[in-house]
């Protein structure tokens, strides 16, 4: 039985700001080479016949629910991409990560500025600090790591700060194992 | 309250290896970074690197990087700096600090007693 | 050579006031990264003195003050104590060496 398709993120964040590229790919295993691609955005067909489909210069418009389908196969799982427009962008590699598993954030500045004394914050209190932009990088998420993220920074000498992001962090399934 | 506490002092030959230690209580010592500052002797303050527990997100100093490693064990809240191939001008007090977040400043607010290291053949 | 430059020795006698200054660049006090003082007596552990230009930590007394102009900062003290003897360091952070930075250090003598 085929595997239901994955779609990815290159670059891996799902908040961009406008005018930014992301390319969105459809994996999956089991699809034959010349097989083309059906990609929904909001519900409806998109004409990209690619694996990737490619968002060049992301608009407001561009937000919202993408999927995609190989053949008749089932469509993806959906992702959600939501495009800003501000100062500062706390972007991370997942919004709902299964523990154990990485997670990554960053605080983006808009047009790659330069951010410095960059602060995070989870649940309200400061939780790393540097003198210039820098990132939160867990290798094994716990469920501790669950909370309400933002980030504030410097930028041309001014002060900003993100809009909030909520991380969560779920158990794993517990492997069943059967009686034979 | 707020304690590093570090490991004693040491005496090497040159070449041998060395790891010390900085052992933070009073404050949850994964959310804040840990420094190491060098004191040579009748020299002053140097800035070696730093070590944020929480996601091991290291920076070294211009004159440390491939020097040292900084490295922490976040479960028993310590901090260490370690060489591979210790050198005579590695003799020097060796310091601890945790870099906090106040009022907006980013300061080190807390030192340990350093730990003083002897390289002599 | 430390990136922050402060004199090697200032003395004073019991009551006077001394300045020690930290002279940087445009890359560290210039760029507005808060500078920071440190007061250091042989065989304890560096005590934060003033942080953020001008502030004190509890229990640092009023006659310790900073001041920052450009692209330096002075550490004031005044009515000088005995137990002031010390070695004192500025502290702050250099953009172009992507590093935190440390003056060299000034030994206050008590006459």
């Known amino acids: 039985v085929p595997q239901k398709p994955k779609v990815s993120l290159n670059p891996p964040w799902n908040r961009i700001f406008k005018g930014e590229n992301v390319t969105l790919t459809c994996n999956g295993n089991n699809f034959f080479e010349v097989s083309s691609t059906k990609w929904f955005h909001n519900g409806s067909l998109s004409e990209e016949t690619n694996s990737s489909l490619n968002i060049v210069n992301a608009k407001f418009e561009d937000s919202g629910e993408y999927k995609c389908q190989h053949q008749q196969v089932n469509e993806s799982e959906p992702v959600y991409l939501e495009v800003f427009s501000d100062w500062l962008l706390l972007q991370a590699s997942a919004e709902v990560v299964m523990e154990g598993q990485p997670l990554f954030l960053r605080c983006h500045g808009w047009r790659n500025w330069d951010v410095y004394k960059v602060i995070y914050y989870k649940d309200g209190e400061a939780l790393k600090y540097w003198y210039e932009n820098h990132n939160i990088s867990i290798t094994n998420a716990t469920v501790e790591d669950s909370g309400t993220y933002y980030c504030t920074g410097k930028v041309w000498q001014l002060d900003y700060e993100s809009e909030p992001l909520n991380i969560t962090v779920i158990k794993a399934p517990r492997e069943k194992y059967w009686l034979q | 309250e707020v304690q590093l506490v570090q490991s004693g002092a040491e005496v090497k030959k040159p070449g041998e290896s060395l790891k010390i230690s900085c052992e933070g209580s009073?404050?949850?010592?994964?959310?804040?970074?840990i420094a190491w500052v060098r004191q040579k002797p009748g020299k002053g303050l140097e800035w070696m690197g730093i070590?944020?527990?929480?996601?091991?997100?290291?920076k070294y100093g211009p004159s440390f990087g491939g020097q040292v490693t900084i490295s922490a064990d976040k479960s028993i809240n310590t901090a260490y700096l370690e060489w591979s191939s210790l050198k005579a001008s590695d003799t020097a007090m060796y310091y601890c600090?945790?870099?906090?977040?106040?009022?907006?400043?980013?300061?080190?607010?807390?030192w340990g007693l350093g730990t003083l290291v002897t390289v002599s053949s | 050579q430390s990136v922050l430059t402060q004199p090697s020795s200032v003395s004073g006698a019991p009551g006077q006031r001394v300045t020690i200054s930290c002279t940087g660049s445009s890359s560290n006090i210039g760029a507005g990264y808060d500078v920071h003082w440190y007061q250091h007596l042989p065989g304890t552990a560096p005590k934060l003195l003033i942080y953020g230009i001008n502030i004190r930590p509890s229990g640092v007394p009023d006659r310790f003050s900073g001041s920052k102009s450009d692209t330096s900062a002075s550490l004031a003290i005044t009515a000088l104590q005995a137990e002031d003897e010390a070695d004192y360091y500025c502290?702050?952070?250099?953009?172009?060496?992507?590093?935190?930075?440390f003056g060299g250090g000034t030994k206050l003598t008590v006459l």
């Open positions: 009073g404050y949850r010592f994964s959310s804040y970074w």
């Open positions: 070590i944020y527990p929480y996601d091991s997100d290291t």
């Open positions: 502290q702050s952070y250099d953009s172009s060496l992507r590093s935190v930075v």
């Open positions: 600090a945790r870099l906090a977040l106040i009022r907006g400043s980013i300061i080190f607010d807390y």
